[in-house]
């Protein structure tokens, strides 16, 4: 019956989410097969290679890191996907050319506090937010 | 001197926040010389087209919209970049096979309320958060 | 010790095409940004492309967009170069080299020459 | 994209006089991102200087880099006879990567 097929395909979205899209697309692994799963990468990053050795005191650098990796469906929770972004990937599935994948980006963010000189010259330490990547899912 | 190189530096800054680092590299529009910057592009998306037409019975579907475009440097003010964004997008010019450039998600979602079935066909009245992007930003 | 070994030059008429390998041992490959650079003869060094570590993002010089497809096989630690629609002008010797993360390119392979003539 | 000039295009020394080789930038460069290489006669470049002043691994003490901006040296104080080859500057803090037109250090 209708109520009973609802029931199970209500118990497959508990168990797999987005199987309900599996039928629309063979395979959209094309050109990410060597492509890894969304996740933080480290990366320390000197601000003299930035250029910015004669405003910064200190630190002389810090573990920025970065977020990089494919979004692909189906998109497991370890990848802190939000719902629009479940939602997007069975868009992506069935028109690859007109909307992207989610992206690969911060969702926990840390501040570091730096030692530099203003305008003046004078010695300020001053906390910057959002400078260091914790965490990262697929948005 | 030194003190006033910091000075004009600072200025810089302030004014023009990234052009610290426009010293390093000419241009890193290799590959993204057609692509517009990042922002919002409408999207709506039929429930019945996902396959979810048996278990949602309101709405049929809603304008969950997504992000796309570039971020690429510089990051204007409109791109609502994260400081995080800024420093990798500083690091992607100098390494840009290390490091990719940050990417265009959702800075502003949404909730929408959905009438569905339950495993057991009851008819439920359900909130989802992050459902619809309403701001994109470079992260 | 780091090395790279290219193959597959040769020989080619204008509008051909041609596939270039560089077999790297030594290093861990996957890790390293790979680029290939060319010196026409008697000429200087021009950088062709790059790539980088998982093979995810590629970069090229303005003179071979569309023309050439850079990739690369972790499983095999091997690099290569599609020529496609060659012209007199791509008439170089073609090197591999290995960017390690804020450096420049070090080693290189000792060449391939690629010759485009009818 | 980053120009770069190098100067003389020959230059015509003898064994054991000092050399100094120019590489001028188009625009201003990070010295970080700034590398000199050598290249024999049928030879792949070898990597001399890296960040305008840092020595590769093996390379004589001879050789030695220094500039800013967009004014870079490559300086050899006393000429072997195995350096008198070409030389060339590079740039390579983001794509395109671009090199020096080289010069060519040749025997007097």
């Known amino acids: 019956s209708a109520s009973s097929r609802r029931r199970q395909q209500s118990r497959n979205r508990s168990t797999q989410s987005q199987d309900v899209a599996r039928v629309s697309s063979a395979s959209d692994y094309n050109s990410s097969e060597l492509k890894t799963a969304c996740r933080k990468h480290e990366l320390y990053v000197s601000f003299q290679d930035l250029g910015w050795q004669d405003w910064i005191i200190a630190p002389k650098g810090y573990a920025a890191n970065y977020c990089d990796g494919e979004c692909s469906f189906p998109l497991n929770a370890h990848m802190n996907a939000t719902n629009h972004a479940i939602v997007q990937t069975l868009v992506h599935l069935m028109n690859p050319e007109y909307v992207p994948k989610p992206c690969c980006a911060p969702t926990k963010l840390n501040a570091i506090s730096v030692l530099y000189f203003d305008d003046n010259s004078n010695v300020i330490l001053k906390k910057y937010r959002n400078m260091v990547v914790r965490a990262c899912g697929c948005h | 001197s030194a003190s006033s190189r910091r000075r004009q530096q600072s200025r810089n800054r302030s004014t023009q926040s990234q052009d610290v680092a426009r010293v390093s590299s000419a241009s890193d529009y290799n590959s993204s010389e057609l692509k517009t910057a990042c922002r919002k592009h409408e999207l709506y998306v039929s429930f019945q087209d996902l396959g979810w037409q048996d278990w949602i019975i309101a709405p049929k579907g809603y304008a969950a919209n997504y992000c796309d475009g570039e971020c690429s440097f510089p990051l204007n003010a409109h791109m609502n970049a994260t400081n995080h964004a800024i420093v990798q997008t500083l690091v992607h010019l100098m390494n840009p096979e290390y490091v990719p450039k940050p990417c265009c998600a959702p800075t502003k979602l949404n909730a929408i309320s959905v009438l569905y079935f339950d495993d057991n066909s009851n008819v439920i009245l359900k909130k989802y958060r992050n459902m619809v992007v309403r701001a994109c930003g470079c992260h | 010790e780091v090395q790279l070994v290219e193959s597959g030059g040769g020989l080619v008429q204008p509008g051909g095409s041609l596939r270039l390998s560089c077999a790297a041992s030594?290093?861990?490959?996957?890790?390293?940004?790979m680029s290939w650079v060319r010196q026409a003869p008697g000429k200087g060094l021009e950088w062709v492309s790059a790539i980088s570590g998982s093979g995810g993002r590629t970069y090229y010089t303005d003179s071979v967009k569309g023309r050439f497809t850079m990739s690369r096989d972790n499983s095999k630690n091997t690099l290569y170069l599609q020529m496609n629609s060659l012209r007199a002008e791509d008439t170089a010797v073609y090197y591999c080299?290995?960017?390690?993360?804020?450096?420049?390119?070090?080693?290189w392979g000792q060449g391939t020459l690629v010759t485009v003539s009818s | 994209e980053i120009v770069l000039t190098q100067s003389p295009g020959t230059l015509s020394l003898s064994p054991g006089e000092g050399a100094t080789l120019s590489c001028r930038a188009s625009?201003?460069?990070?010295?970080?991102?700034l590398a000199w290489y050598q290249q024999k006669p049928g030879q792949a470049p070898r990597l001399l200087i890296y960040g305008a002043s840092s020595r590769a691994t093996g390379i004589p003490d001879r050789f030695s880099g220094s500039g800013s901006g967009t004014d870079f040296t490559l300086t050899i104080s006393r000429l072997e006879p195995e350096d008198f080859v070409v030389y060339y500057c590079?740039?390579?803090?983001?794509?395109?990567?671009?090199f020096g037109g080289g010069t060519k250090v040749e025997i007097k």
């Open positions: 030594g290093f861990t490959f996957s890790s390293y940004a």
């Open positions: 625009q201003s460069v990070s010295s970080s991102y």
């Open positions: 080299a290995k960017r390690p993360y804020n450096s420049p390119f070090d080693p």
């Open positions: 590079q740039h390579f803090g983001g794509t395109p990567f671009t």
